[in-house]
Interface confidence: low
């Protein structure tokens, strides 16, 4: 109503009304009773006639002091306003009414009677009365989801008390009206009747916030917009849904009752704060039902599955299948909606079964001297999960093998123990081994499980006699012998031993290598005799040692043989005369500027070699006439021309060289001397002419 009136201090209404839900909560704002203060300087203080239930703040907002269910005793109370300076008092009545219960019929009924009026307030401004927005808590409209109609379904009527004077048009704005999803809420522009056009789904939109507008026929706003909140009330229209249809969990065998296994989870699209969305879980069935039909329990609120009975044994039951049910309405079987899922619980292996040998004694045989061969196959059984550390066998030899001749490897596929020989065995020393072997797993046995006697076995290993190689001892055999021995001299006896003491075989000897063919061996007794003269200076002798190898063969099946080396250390005798070195030399036709240095080559060694004596023979006389020899030291001498000139040519100069042996050995060696024309440096200039000149005799 836009009429002009003088400002009147006090409450503008005689009675204030508010429509509330049955449950009023502590601190809940109920309505606003703001005082019309024409003289803006007044300071007003508010008070409630029911201070235990209601209080009013300095802005006139009424709040509930405590939580209580709304009943007729709270239906009416008074609010007092008092001027703090003049002590002048005013009062107004407040009427509280209960919102009707939410059946579709009651919603419909309330829609027919309920009316929301644009609130009014007057204040003096510039001498005129002016309309102002007043704070007003409009209770929300509660509307159940999935209503069956008929539609449109009337909710409330929006009106302005200015419709007495003016022709007004009403509209609503906001999501659900003119914004997506559009057209859910409509308003009759003339009557202000607000209606819903279709069923609502709380799970899509749980709350609508609309604004109602009133304008005159020219489109001018005559009221401030008011907020309308529509709460969609939940119905139990959604079943619980498990996040997975099949849930997989594990639990170790032998677990104590109370062991956590897994958690299953279902969700319900309905309101989680209402019974419609409050779920409870239960186990419907367990398969298999051994050793007890109730091996597991489920926390009905959290979905945690735990063991509840002892006796989980993977070797008996490897997997349990539980059917789990989730029911809303806190699990009420009558009203609640349910769904099921499967929990598959795998019982995991622990090492609660030791490996057990399939026999108390295993037998094997091994040829002597062989290594890296499999002697015996040890077999075990283990009820734990194959090819896991609780099943994989580890074998050890606990007795009967003090020198570590055997080892046991595990065949990864069969789990068998492969007993192998790692050090050669001599039949003549050990004919049999009785090994004590133990089988364990790669991981320790579970607590409280002991190794039974069947985890230990014996392995009886028979050593097979093999025809072994005869061997010479010592090998090599070293003897010292003077060279020059005549053929037929017995040097030594070189015999071999046969390791096969029990076979009583004959050994025959043959020569294997004798580079100079100096020796023979007696095939029966191994006596070595010379068949030629031993020569220390032979190319077959290295560092005074002559090596010959011999073969000793037994008459076993198959025959075996061994080789032995005889090393003859040859002592030198003076059997080699020295020779001149070099055998060819060059000098000039005149004695200066050069001379020829010579030495001696003697294949013997000290004391049968140097120092040497060098001399020229008496015959032919031309030698001593033309040449002179001068001893430099025990090994070297110098040959020079004695005459002033000797024609270019090739001359053979005989030189007598004597060694220091006892008796000494002498030899006349020929030195070929090329005499040539020389340049100033003493180098030959006419080599070609000399070559053509032929030989002379040192003359």
């Amino acid at each position: 109503s836009g009429e002009i009136a003088l400002c009147k201090t006090g409450f503008p209404e005689d009675v204030y009304s508010a429509v509330l839900s049955k449950d009023v909560h502590e601190g809940q704002p109920l309505l606003n009773v703001k005082f019309s203060n024409c003289n803006g300087k007044r300071k007003v203080q508010y008070e409630s006639s029911e201070p235990a239930d209601f209080k009013v703040d300095e802005d006139g907002m009424v709040y509930a002091v405590r939580s209580f269910p709304l009943s007729s005793e709270h239906a009416k109370f008074l609010i007092y306003a008092q001027d703090k300076e003049t002590q002048e008092k005013w009062q107004v009545a407040v009427k509280l009414s209960l919102k009707p219960t939410l059946t579709e019929e009651s919603v419909k009924e309330s829609a027919e009677v309920e009316e929301i009026v644009f609130p009014r307030q007057f204040s003096k401004h510039s001498g005129h009365l002016q309309r102002q927005k007043r704070d007003w808590v409009i209770p929300p409209i509660n509307l159940p989801e999935n209503s069956r109609g008929p539609f449109p379904q009337e909710l409330v009527r929006i009106r302005s008390d200015r419709d007495k004077n003016l022709s007004l048009r009403y509209s609503v704005t906001g999501p659900g009206a003119d914004q997506p999803p559009t057209g859910i809420f409509i308003i009759n522009p003339i009557s202000g009747q607000l209606s819903v056009t279709k069923p609502l789904d709380r799970e899509q939109i749980a709350r609508f916030h609309l604004r109602a507008h009133a304008v005159d026929i020219n489109g001018n706003q005559v009221e401030n917009p008011i907020d309308i909140v529509i709460n969609v009330i939940d119905m139990n229209d959604n079943r619980p849904e498990f996040l997975h249809q099949v849930w997989n969990g594990t639990v170790p065998e032998g677990s104590k009752p109370g062991t956590y296994v897994m958690t299953v989870t279902a969700i319900d699209a309905d309101d989680p704060n209402a019974l419609n969305g409050m779920l409870r879980y239960r186990i419907v069935s367990q398969a298999p039902s051994t050793p007890s039909p109730n091996m597991f329990t489920i926390n009905n609120e959290t979905g945690d599955i735990i063991t509840v009975a002892a006796g989980l044994d993977r070797e008996k039951v490897q997997q349990y299948t539980l059917i789990i049910q989730a029911t809303d309405m806190e699990g009420n079987p009558t009203y609640g909606l349910s769904n099921t899922a499967t929990a598959v619980i795998t019982v995991t292996d622990v090492n609660d079964n030791p490996p057990e040998f399939t026999a108390m004694t295993f037998y094997g045989e091994v040829p002597e001297n062989r290594v890296d061969i499999i002697v015996a196959n040890l077999t075990v059984t283990d009820k734990d999960q194959p090819h896991t550390p609780a099943w994989n066998a580890v074998y050890r030899i606990s007795g009967g093998d003090p020198t570590g001749r055997f080892a046991i490897q595990t065949d990864p596929n069969s789990n068998d123990g492969l007993v192998t020989v790692v050090k050669p065995i001599d039949f003549e020393t050990n004919r049999m081994f009785v090994l004590t072997v133990a089988a364990e797993n790669q991981v320790p046995l579970a607590k409280g499980i002991q190794h039974p006697p069947q985890s230990t076995a014996t392995v009886s290993v028979t050593v097979i006699d093999v025809n072994e190689n005869p061997y010479f001892a010592p090998n090599p055999k070293i003897i010292r012998q003077e060279e020059g021995l005549h053929a037929g001299t017995m040097l030594t006896t070189f015999t071999a031993q046969d390791p096969d003491r029990y076979m009583q075989q004959n050994i025959r000897y043959t020569k294997l290598s004798d580079p100079a063919n100096w020796l023979k061996i007696d095939p029966v007794n191994g006596q070595i005799t010379t068949i030629a003269v031993l020569d220390r200076e032979s190319p077959n002798v290295k560092n005074n040692i002559y090596n010959a190898t011999f073969l000793a063969s037994d008459n076993g099946i198959p025959p075996m043989s061994g080789t032995g080396t005889l090393q003859i250390y040859l002592l030198d005798i003076n059997d080699n005369a020295p020779q001149v070195l070099p055998q060819e030399a060059e000098t000039c036709e005149t004695p200066d500027p050069n001379s020829i240095n010579i030495t001696a080559l003697d294949y013997d060694i000290d004391p049968n070699a140097g120092p040497f004596a060098f001399d020229l023979p008496l015959s032919p006389v031309t030698i001593k006439r033309n040449w002179t020899i001068t001893r430099l030291n025990g090994d070297f001498a110098q040959l020079n021309l004695k005459i002033k000139f000797l024609e270019a040519g090739i001359y053979e100069v005989p030189i007598i060289i004597t060694d220091s042996g006892n008796p000494p050995k002498s030899n006349i060696s020929i030195l070929r001397v090329k005499v040539c024309q020389c340049d100033s440096n003493g180098d030959c200039t006419d080599v070609d002419r000399i070559v053509g000149a032929g030989l002379g005799t040192g003359a």
Epitope: D372, I374, D411, I557, P558, P559
Partner: antibody, heavy 119, light 107 residues
Framework: QVQLVQSGAEVKKPGASVKLSCKAS????????IQWVRQAPGQGLEWIGW????????KYNEKFKDRATLTADKSINTVYMELSRLRSDDTAVYFC????????????WGQGTLVTVSS | DIVLTQSPATLSLSPGERATLSCTAS???????LHWYQQKPGSAPRLWIF???NLASGIPDRFSGGSGSTDYTLTISRLEPEDFAVYYC????????FGGGTKVEIK
């Protein structure tokens, strides 16, 4: 020097038998195992079995156990391999080889004998 | 029986390049019993490497052999024209088997 000389090529019909020889020289015949290995055209090597003249011991690959027979004549240092009930997939070059002193390697090989099985 | 798997089946390389041939045993083989042979068309195989890493008589030192637990390798440091052939690995540890061969061919 060590030599293994094998007999000449053979052409046989399916179902027939073939006997191949391998003559050894240059070493003590009774001291070494003689192996037989075959190689089908364009294929790898397949072990048939071995014969030890020293003791007469024989070992066969399970695959050939029922069809192969290994024998020897020590007087002429020769090992024989007979394969019966021939099939077309027995067409191959058959080698004899000497096993070394230790470790099981084949240190000397024959030149091979081609056996063709065809109807 | 122990299965020997050789890889690759064919190795295409140029002279001067390095070649690595692999032989994997289905179960453990003692290194003393793993050998390699070279075979050229129309010829018998020839012992090349014995006991995993020992070169047979007359084999050039550009060849070498090595091993892991069940993996064995033949390596040619620098390929020469005469090295192009098929190489077989062979075990005598349990029964007796050969690998399928690796053909080293000129790229």
């Amino acid at each position: 020097q060590v030599q293994l000389v094998q007999s000449g090529a053979e052409v046989k019909k399916p179902g027939a038998s073939v006997k191949l020889s391998c003559k050894a020289s240059g070493f003590t015949f009774t001291d070494y195992l003689i192996q037989w290995v075959r190689q089908a055209p364009g294929q790898g090597l397949e072990w048939i079995g071995w014969f030890y003249p020293g003791s007469g011991s024989i070992k066969y690959n399970e695959k050939f156990k029922d069809r192969a027979t290994l024998t020897a004549d020590k007087s002429i240092n020769t090992v024989y391999m007979e394969l019966s009930r021939l099939r077309s997939d027995d067409t191959a070059v058959y080698f004899c080889a000497r096993r070394g002193d230790w470790g099981g390697f084949f240190d000397y090989w024959g030149q091979g004998t081609l056996v063709t099985v065809s109807s | 029986d122990i299965v020997l798997t050789q890889s690759p089946a064919t190795l295409s390389l140029s002279p001067g390049e390095r070649a690595t041939l692999s032989c994997t045993a289905s179960s453990s083989v003692s290194s003393s019993y793993l050998h390699w042979y070279q075979q050229k068309p129309g010829s018998a195989p020839r012992l090349w490497i014995f006991s995993t890493s020992n070169l047979a008589s007359g084999i050039p030192d550009r060849f070498s052999g090595g091993s892991g637990s069940t993996d064995y390798t033949l390596t040619i440091s620098r390929l020469e024209p005469e090295d192009f052939a098929v190489y077989y690995c062979h075990q005598y540890h349990r029964s007796l088997t050969f690998g399928g061969g690796t053909k080293v061919e000129i790229k």
